[in-house]
């Protein structure tokens, strides 16, 4: 069963050029987390494996930053990375978690 | 339950459009998944397509991107598949498949038809 | 395209044996490779997700593991309804591409 709940920054707002800490938290479970993956509509940002460590995808590279902890940061915003942000959070035994953030990059 | 279910005519003609339509039941495909074409050849290789998000937005496959549109009926929960131009190389079997978006996976897959390009 | 090269193309086993199939992709997909068993007439049916994931209900005698290129899947002893055909897939980005299968038959 399930008992675990995902707490994330919500809906957050940043300066175009500046940078952004994308935050989530799994909360209220024992479960292991064995992975975490960071995506952006049907794009894999980035994965934290619990045995292999951090992978930033390469066309994000660049802007894209582990961290803290499960978290990521992004910087060099542009007004193109407006949008919805996924936490997946698998996790062992209890499943897949998921928490969404909306980010608005401002001019 | 999810199911997926293929349609279509089985028999196309060389040059003509291949058209083929996936029902779907207990998921709505405005929900956050994407909706896939993947075609096995008679060899059984496997190739994917294309999909269509929740949120209409379409990826296709560069080695068809000149023919293949991948459109949806939200009112009957349906998905399609428009493949111009067809030749006998574009015959096989047909799926339709369900992509977590944040999942990366086929979790759910219809049972194929069988479709066949010859005058 | 990443192309994904699975071997065996075939193999002759006997119930209780230990089988092991490869794939090797031809760029780093950290552990983004998911397998799939096929039997005949069937749609192919999901086992192992994100390299070493097992499916919900998939039983743990199916294994998978490798990150970068190099995959294995592995079924530690084979049951008399496992002869099928098994397709590694790589879901780290689209196009998304398959192996070309590993046809496992009784010996």
């Known amino acids: 069963m399930m008992t675990g709940t995902i707490e994330t920054t919500g809906n957050i707002s940043a300066e175009k050029g500046g940078s952004i800490i994308l935050q989530c938290h799994l909360s209220s479970t024992t479960a292991q987390v064995t992975q975490v993956n960071w995506e952006q509509q049907d794009q894999l940002l980035a994965i934290c494996n619990a045995d292999l460590g951090w992978h930033i995808s390469p066309s994000f590279k660049d802007r894209v930053a582990p961290g803290p902890g499960l978290g990521l940061t992004l910087q060099s915003l542009t007004v193109n990375d407006t949008g919805e942000y996924f936490c997946i959070y698998h996790t062992y035994p209890d499943g897949t978690y998921t928490g969404r953030i909306f980010l608005e990059v401002l001019e | 339950q999810v199911q997926l279910q293929e349609s279509g005519p089985g028999l196309v003609k060389p040059s003509q459009t291949l058209s083929l339509t996936c029902t779907v039941t207990?998921?709505?495909?405005?929900?956050?998944?994407?909706w896939n074409w993947i075609r096995q050849f008679p060899g059984k290789k496997l190739e994917w397509m294309g999909y269509i998000t929740y949120s209409g937005r379409t990826t296709y496959n560069p080695s068809l991107k000149s023919r293949i549109t991948i459109s949806r009926d939200t009112s009957k929960n349906q998905f399609s598949l428009k493949l111009s131009s067809v030749t006998a190389a574009d015959t096989a079997t047909y799926y339709c498949?369900?992509?977590?978006?944040?999942?990366?996976?086929?979790?759910?897959w219809g049972q194929g038809t069988l479709l066949t390009v010859s005058s | 395209d990443i192309v994904m090269t699975q071997s065996p193309s075939s193999m002759s086993t006997s119930v209780g044996d230990r089988v092991t199939i490869t794939c090797r992709a031809s760029q780093d997909v950290f552990n983004q490779v998911a397998w799939y068993q096929q039997k005949p007439g069937k749609s192919p049916k999901l086992l192992i997700y994100s390299a070493s994931f097992r499916y919900t209900g998939v039983p743990d005698r199916f294994s998978g593991s490798g990150s970068g290129t190099d995959f294995t899947f592995t079924i530690s002893s084979v049951q008399a309804e496992d002869f099928a055909t098994y397709y590694c897939?790589?879901?780290?980005?689209?196009?998304?591409?398959f192996g070309a299968g590993t046809k496992l038959e009784l010996k």
């Open positions: 207990g998921s709505s495909i405005t929900s956050d998944y994407a």
């Open positions: 897939q790589q879901h780290y980005s689209t196009p998304l591409t």
């Open positions: 498949a369900r992509w977590g978006l944040l999942r990366r996976y086929f979790d759910y």
